[in-house]
Interface confidence: medium
């Protein structure tokens, strides 16, 4: 039937033309919509680590590109910490002494992992190389 009528080719052409692509750059976006759900099931990469590598950040050296945790909870709190001198204080208003140590307030971010990603490589712990 396809050989005689080329119906698949004609239908596909009509679908593609209905998207009104202005240039060749728009076409991959359609492919992304189709392929992304499938690639997500195979592997997910950590965008933060990729950015750190691009920025030549030392922190990224021992981090895996494979994303493990997809759901995290970040909690920002303030804690009291000792400092060697008032020069090390966060600000003069946030500095005090107990007579034997200088103290200041420090912002601390606690990151709690809640749910793992749902892809094949999540539990493989393979090296990136």
């Amino acid at each position: 039937v396809e050989v005689a009528t080329h119906y698949l080719e004609i239908i596909t052409q009509l679908i593609v033309e209905s998207f009104h692509f202005k240039n060749g750059e728009d076409a991959p976006d359609l492919l992304k919509v189709i392929t992304k759900p499938f690639t997500k099931l195979i592997v997910q990469l950590d965008k933060k680590v990729i950015s750190q590598i691009a920025m030549n950040d030392e922190k990224a050296k021992n981090k895996s590109l494979v994303k493990i945790w997809c759901k995290t909870f970040t909690n920002k709190t303030q804690i009291n910490v000792t400092v060697p001198s008032t020069a090390n204080c966060t600000s003069p208003s946030l500095c005090w002494t107990d007579g034997i140590q200088n103290w200041t307030m420090k912002n601390v971010t606690y990151k709690e992992n809640i749910a793992k990603c749902q892809h094949i490589f999540v539990n493989f712990h393979l090296p990136d190389l």
Partner: antibody, heavy 120, light 107 residues
Framework: QVQLLESGGGLVQPGGSLRLSCAAS????????MAWVRQAPGKGLEWVSA????????YYADSVKGRFTISRDTSKNTLSLQMSSLRAEDTAIYYC?????????????WGQGTLVTVSS | DIQMTQSPSSLSASVGDRVTIACRAS??????LAWYQQKPGKVPKLLIY???TLQSGVPSRFSGSGSGTDFTLTISSLQPEDVATYYC?????????FGQGTKLEIK
């Protein structure tokens, strides 16, 4: 005049507990940070623990952290050191010491010391 | 932790001599340094605080100097009663550490 009188020392077996006390007089106890400093036989001085004048902040040397607890009772002008899980290396003369009048933990008055011997 | 290193560990000098004991901190401690004297079988006694301030009642032959990491205790004219072990102490930040001591004897 300033007086610091320690008590509670003695012979104890490894793993045992002991409570040292220091009776303070001759100064405003509630205004001074206090500390315990020890000296093993024939050895140098080692700071053990400290407590701020209010009692809100306590400090410990790594060697005693989790085993010793410092506290103060302003109503009785007493400083205490609860020692548990004692080891042979805790054998020393324990001095109660008063903070100097300026900022920081230096010691302008010391007690006569109480000997703690940890041995089986 | 800040390590305090004293030198020499022992020294022998004659009555009337000028004696100096050095103390070095492994990190900058500003001038938050104290010196103590401990005579044999006795309790430590504060000599100097904030590196150079003489404690009330301490003879003027004792003096202290230095700032940052290097400090010195000087006895301008050694007396027989100065026989003792001398300790420096960091009180810039916890843990408050002492030097290992310098034993001073009379020749």
């Amino acid at each position: 005049q300033v007086q610091l009188l320690e008590s509670g020392g003695g012979l104890v077996q490894p793993g045992g507990s002991l409570r040292l006390s220091c009776a303070a007089s001759g100064f405003t106890f509630s205004s001074s940070a206090m500390a315990w400093v020890r000296q093993a036989p024939g050895k140098g001085l080692e700071w053990v623990s400290a407590i701020s004048s209010s009692g809100d902040n306590t400090y410990y040397a790594d060697s005693v952290k989790g085993r010793f607890t410092i506290s103060r009772d302003t109503s009785k002008n007493t400083l205490s050191l609860q020692m548990s899980s004692l080891r042979a290396e805790d054998t020393a003369i324990y001095y109660c010491a008063k903070q100097g009048t300026n900022w920081g933990l230096y010691f302008d008055y010391w007690g006569q010391g109480t000997l703690v011997t940890v041995s089986s | 932790d800040i390590q305090m290193t004293q030198s020499p560990s022992s020294l022998s000098a004659s009555v009337g001599d000028r004696v100096t004991i050095a103390c070095r901190a492994s990190q900058v401690i500003s001038n938050y340094l104290a010196w103590y004297q401990q005579k044999p079988g006795k309790v430590p006694k504060l000599l100097i605080y904030v590196a150079s301030t003489l404690q009330s009642g301490v003879p003027s032959r004792f003096s202290g100097s230095g700032s940052g990491t290097d400090f010195t205790l000087t006895i301008s004219s050694l007396q027989p009663e100065d026989v003792a072990t001398y300790y420096c102490q960091n009180y810039n930040s916890a843990p408050w550490t002492f030097g290992q001591g310098t034993k001073l004897e009379i020749k």
